[in-house]
Interface confidence: medium
């Protein structure tokens, strides 16, 4: 009936989700640039992968228009609070689009993690998770920013990460 | 055209998502074993369910290879800080695979929740959420661990939970 | 072969996810009512959208039965702690169904954010994220509640939000 190839392909797609865009990028030593730019990410090693999404200078880039669940977690930690630290740490996901000159805030969290040091210890840890559904056109990009990035702890890619999948 | 049955099935699948693996497991009184093992979960009662995934001794087990968004939340709480508590609580999702003898860290958070008690009250609460996309082969397992698990509050299955779905 | 229209539609659906229910609602000035009801949300402006889900008085309403990943984030913040504030803030997702007279707790977090003020500053910020898979029948509703809602910071729709998509 002429649908043969497409039919098999569709069955295959349905069964395996092979064509659904998804990505999970992990924190690495090179993630924190100190340049005021977004965090950079590992795209291939360990748990990191790209499927139907591209990566460019810290950004996940959509190859297919649609709604995506995007997410990021950052691990924060320190011993006491660094000098000059504002009482707020901002962790956000931002969209870059040719349609606007500036990045667009998508999902943002503000936290005051230094207040978590206990009376026994000046060491503190905190984690910030963001996730939500946003629309991306082909070529639009999503990046992660943390202000103040000095508090981001990277270690091994399991504590700070960034990902997305089409919904 | 010979595709009749399959065609209807495909339409049905597409419409209902019936075959997309998904699970949501909930905390129960038996979740905390004190044995050093992973947390255990309710799989059937209340909000808990398994669809296309298996469960075994605290682990979600993949029946179908692919990328899964896995997630867990644990509710932490206490009155003051327990003796012997490190300044860090670690909440993580870990993979068990026949290909490695040890569990593999997937997604991990560290928090210092006891620092959240206020001057007025020694009671404190904190919550840790983890979620991210990982690849699972058939038979590979994912478990949740919390160190120190004594701080996990279970109550009714809505505050501490563990789930996954294929993306 | 008689499948033509449906076939093309199915291909299209598969490629675009156009028929997969999804929504992302954002916080707005009108979100906090002070009435004891659930939070209200923006459904159209900015990043907010509804696709295959309805909205009614703060609730996402299912048009199609199935399993949904539902999520919400709320941004909390303040200067010191308001009088009468319990040591706990509760942020939860709740289901309304014709089958029960009362709302059903789905996913809940408790936090003690006021303890996060540092010794240098009485200003504190905290964020609560919830996400998990739940089953919804046609017409069932999900709402977000925060107790004490006086601590929710709305600003621009990026810090407090509510969404869902079918899995």
């Amino acid at each position: 009936d002429g649908h043969g190839g497409s039919w098999e392909q569709l069955i295959q797609e349905r069964r395996s989700h092979q064509n659904n865009p998804a990505a999970h990028l992990t924190g690495a030593n090179s993630s924190l640039t100190g340049s005021g730019g977004p965090l950079l990410w590992e795209t291939q090693l360990g748990l990191a992968f790209l499927r139907g999404l591209d990566y460019h200078d810290g950004a996940l880039v959509a190859n297919k228009a649609g709604y995506y669940y995007i997410y990021s977690k950052v691990q924060l930690g320190g011993v006491g609070c660094p000098l000059g630290l504002a009482s707020t740490i901002t962790h956000g996901l931002y969209k870059r689009t040719p349609r606007y000159p500036e990045e667009l805030e998508l999902l943002v969290s503000q936290q005051s993690p230094c207040g978590r040091a206990t009376s026994n210890s000046r060491v503190w840890w905190d984690s910030s998770f963001l996730g939500g559904v946003v629309h991306l056109e082909v070529g639009e990009e999503v990046v992660v920013r943390v202000l103040d990035e000095r508090l981001v702890r990277l270690r091994d890619g399991t504590r700070s990460y960034f990902g997305a999948f089409m919904v | 055209d010979g595709h009749g049955g399959s065609w209807e099935q495909l339409i049905q699948e597409r419409r209902s998502h019936q075959n997309n693996p998904a699970a949501h497991l909930t905390g129960a009184n038996s979740s905390l074993t004190g044995s050093g093992g992973p947390l255990l979960w309710e799989t059937q009662l209340g909000l808990a369910f398994l669809r296309g995934l298996d469960y075994h001794d605290g682990a979600l087990v993949a029946n179908k290879a692919g990328y899964y968004y896995i997630y867990s939340k644990v509710q932490l709480g206490g009155v003051g800080c327990p003796l012997g508590l490190a300044s860090t609580i670690t909440h993580g999702l870990y993979k068990r695979t026949p290909r490695y003898p040890e569990e593999l860290e997937l997604l991990v958070s560290q928090q210092s929740p006891c620092g959240r008690a206020t001057s007025n009250s020694r009671v404190w609460w904190d919550s840790s959420f983890l979620g991210g996309v990982v690849h699972l082969e058939v038979g590979e397992e994912v478990v949740v661990r919390v160190l120190d698990e004594r701080l996990v509050r279970l109550r009714d299955g809505t505050r501490s939970y563990f789930g996954a779905f294929m993306v | 072969d008689g499948h033509g229209g449906s076939w093309e539609q199915l291909i299209q659906e598969r490629r675009s996810h156009q028929n997969n229910p999804a929504a992302h609602l954002t916080g707005a000035n009108s979100s906090l009512t002070g009435s004891g009801g659930p939070l209200l949300w923006e459904t159209q402006l900015g990043l907010a959208f509804l696709r295959g889900l309805d909205y009614h008085d703060g609730a996402l309403v299912a048009n199609k039965a199935g399993y949904y990943y539902i999520y919400s984030k709320v941004q909390l913040g303040g200067v010191g702690c308001p009088l009468g504030l319990a040591s706990t803030i509760t942020h939860g997702l709740y289901k309304r169904t014709p089958r029960y007279p009362e709302e059903l707790e789905l996913l809940v977090s408790q936090q003690s954010p006021c303890g996060r003020a540092t010794s240098n500053s009485r200003v504190w910020w905290d964020s609560s994220f919830l996400g998990g898979v739940v089953h919804l029948e046609v017409g069932e509703e999900v709402v977000v509640r925060v107790l004490d809602e006086r601590l929710v910071r709305l600003r621009d729709g990026t810090r407090s939000y509510f969404g869902a998509f079918m899995v």
Epitope: - | L32, G34, G77, G78, V79, G80, P82, L83, G84, L85, A86, R122, V123, R150, R153, R155 | -
Partner: antibody
Framework: QVQLVQSGAEVKKPGASVKVSCKAS????????VHWVRQAPGQGLEWIGA????????SYNQKFKGRATLTADKSTSTAYMELSSLRSEDTAVYYC??????????????WGQGTLVTVSS | EIVMTQSPATLSVSPGERATLSCKAS??????????MNWYQQKPGQAPRLLIY???NLESGIPARFSGSGSGTEFTLTISSLQSEDFAVYYC?????????FGQGTKLEIK
């Protein structure tokens, strides 16, 4: 079965120190707090403090802070309570007790037999 | 610190009868749906023995005639039908926060 066996009775002079031992068996010593409670003759029970053998962390009743020292030896599964600058009012039976695993409900489910410490000049 | 007050100081009851012992905390000892109140029995020359933990849970090996109830600041230990071996001193203890404090005890004696 869980057992806590304490050292024998002691007689001490005022101003001296005493060290009481508590040897644990029948459970994972490093997973449970060991609490110390005393009981003066004909009186009620008074909590002194606790030690977590897993890492030696301690918590004290402010009344005894500075005078009581709680320690634990993982290699021998033995907890110790040392009380210094003894006075006559410290004459009491000193008990060690195992705390519950879940710290927020620190009930004492197993007790030692008690050690009588007499402070007399 | 949390002050625990037991009443009565002495209770005289006949064997086979019901005994009700009370304990009051100076502040609530409730947390997350549990009440952090425990009850112990002590006989002369012996160490205390745990009977009830978190207000109403019966410790393993303790006879079912013992039961605990209450929440917030007011708690009760009930012995439904007194046996000869039950005559002893009973202590309540809060484990809500340190210092963990005990009541002064209730002496249960044979009437």
């Amino acid at each position: 079965q869980v057992q806590l066996v304490q050292s024998g009775a002691e007689v001490k002079k005022p101003g001296a120190s005493v060290k009481v031992s508590c040897k644990a068996s029948g459970y994972t010593f490093t997973s449970y707090n060991v609490h110390w409670v005393r009981q003066a003759p004909g009186q009620g029970l008074e909590w002194i403090g606790a030690v977590y053998p897993g890492n030696g962390d301690t918590s004290y009743n402010q009344k005894f802070k500075g005078r009581a020292t709680l320690t634990a030896d993982k290699s021998t599964s033995t907890a110790y309570m040392e009380l210094s600058s003894l006075r006559s009012e410290d004459t009491a039976v000193y008990y060690c007790a195992r705390g519950s695993y879940y710290y927020t409900s620190s009930y004492f489910d197993h007790w030692g037999q008690g050690t009588l410490v007499t402070v007399s000049s | 610190e949390i002050v625990m007050t037991q009443s009565p100081a002495t209770l005289s009851v006949s064997p086979g009868e019901r005994a009700t012992l009370s304990c009051k905390a100076s502040q609530s000892v409730d947390f997350d749906g549990d009440s952090y109140m425990n009850w112990y029995q002590q006989k002369p020359g012996q160490a205390p023995r745990l009977l009830i933990y978190t207000a109403s849970n019966l410790e393993s090996g303790i006879p079912a005639r013992f039961s605990g109830s209450g929440s917030g600041t007011e708690f009760t230990l009930t012995i439904s039908s007194l046996q000869s071996e039950d005559f002893a001193v009973y202590y309540c203890q809060q484990s809500y926060e340190d210092p963990f404090t005990f009541g002064q005890g209730t002496k249960l004696e044979i009437k």
